[in-house]
């Protein structure tokens, strides 16, 4: 069954800055993400941001920046202006909607150990990066290997017969044994979130700049698409009309202009799956 995870972090450099990370684990495509605080969406929670995979983002104070991190995860940066830091005890909730299949919501708050009131400085969540783990593991193994070889050489010097030398086969076996723990540690310490490719993130469209539309890729959970899958059709300015052939919304009682470019209200953002599935564009 689909799941939603929520992680709240305090920035180590600025005690007044918080970041909420949310992700969707499951099949299906995400049609909308809402982030709220103080409770779940529709149950006393206050909206902070709404993110649409094709049309951009909308956010409200104290939200500073909402953005897509991957095709199925988002982050929201918050600026805490108050001196008492109300975020420290606040619950943040993320709701992932997949219309019309269903919606899934989960909540989380800042871990108590990250409270700025404590003497210990706030630390980020201890995620050991896979590449770092690999380097540390490899250097440890090499260090051990060198020590072991030195030990063997010293033992050889003290032996009376010079004929006993480590064969080529033995050294190969030694090398193989030295590498195996490194590979195992890399596999064991590999964190799936540490190596997420963030090249799928769309440009965010804040409502403060309604005319700053850009072309955006279609996002579908668990359907990774490279930059080549990005849409080429631009999303056009607000207040525009939809062409008749696309069969989309037009202002009540008005006709789409017959001259000039055919401006669309439902952008034809074609990505991994045709937008027909999302907007009904023909």
């Amino acid at each position: 069954t689909p799941e939603v995870w929520v992680q709240v972090q305090m920035e180590a450099t600025e005690l007044s800055s918080f970041t909420v990370h949310c992700g969707f684990l499951g099949p299906g495509s995400i049609s909308l993400v809402t982030v709220s605080w103080g409770g779940p969406d529709g149950a006393g929670g206050t909206k902070l941001a709404v993110l649409h995979p094709e049309l951009g983002t909308r956010q409200w104070a104290p939200a500073r920046q909402a953005r897509w991190e991957t095709q199925s995860s988002i982050s929201l940066a918050l600026e805490d202006s108050g001196a008492s830091s109300p975020f420290a005890n606040t619950t943040f909730c993320c709701k992932f909607a997949s219309f019309p299949e269903g919606s899934w919501e989960s909540c989380g708050s800042l871990p108590p150990s990250s409270d700025p009131g404590l003497s210990a400085p706030p630390t980020p969540v201890p995620i050991l990066r896979a590449d770092l783990a690999g380097i540390l593991g490899l250097s440890g193994v090499l260090l051990f290997g060198c020590g072991y070889l030195l030990h063997l050489l010293r033992r050889q010097k003290h032996r009376p017969t010079p004929r006993l030398q480590p064969s080529h086969t033995n050294s190969q076996a030694l090398t193989a044994q030295a590498w195996a723990p490194s590979q195992a540690s890399q596999a064991a310490l590999h964190d799936p979130y540490a190596t997420i490719n963030t090249s799928f993130c769309p440009a965010t469209l804040d409502t403060a700049h309604p005319n700053g539309w850009a072309s955006l890729p279609t996002h579908a959970a668990h359907q990774p698409q490279g930059p080549a899958a990005s849409a080429s059709t631009p999303i056009l300015a607000r207040g525009s009309f939809v062409s008749v052939e696309n069969g989309l919304y037009t202002q009540a009682g008005e006709r789409p202009p017959h001259t000039g470019p055919g401006l669309t209200l439902f952008p034809d953002c074609r990505g991994p799956r045709a937008v027909e599935g999302r907007f009904g564009v023909r």
């Epitope: 909308l32 529709g42 219309f99 539309w213 999303i235 209200l265």
Partner: nanobody, 120 residues
Framework: EVQLVESGGGLVQPGGSLRLSCAAS????????MGWFRQAPGKGLEGVAH???????RYVESVKGRFTISRDNAKNSLYLQMNSLRAEDTAVYYC??????????????WGQGTMVTVSS
Amino acid sequence: EVQLVESGGGLVQPGGSLRLSCAASGFTSRTDCMGWFRQAPGKGLEGVAHIDSDGIPRYVESVKGRFTISRDNAKNSLYLQMNSLRAEDTAVYYCVVGFKFGDYCAPNDWGQGTMVTVSS
């Protein structure tokens, strides 16, 4: 929790009329549009009509002049009056509340849907 319950669907002959209703509860102040989407059998989702928080209705081109969307704030209800129905209007109709992105109402919550069948 936001709850939307549609009613009024059914079987109707071409040229006939139907009135869909949607009873809403648990609204949040920042939801800024309410409307109807539909999904025809084997087809994609299509926005039919929506009303902004300012009360301005918007329609998909194929239903203009035939469908009328209205809202009763006192009853927390949304309606869709469908006249001159055609076979191509056959679909499951969903009542939605959502957020505006330009002139598009992105669904945040929706009902279970009501089936409208236009057939002779």
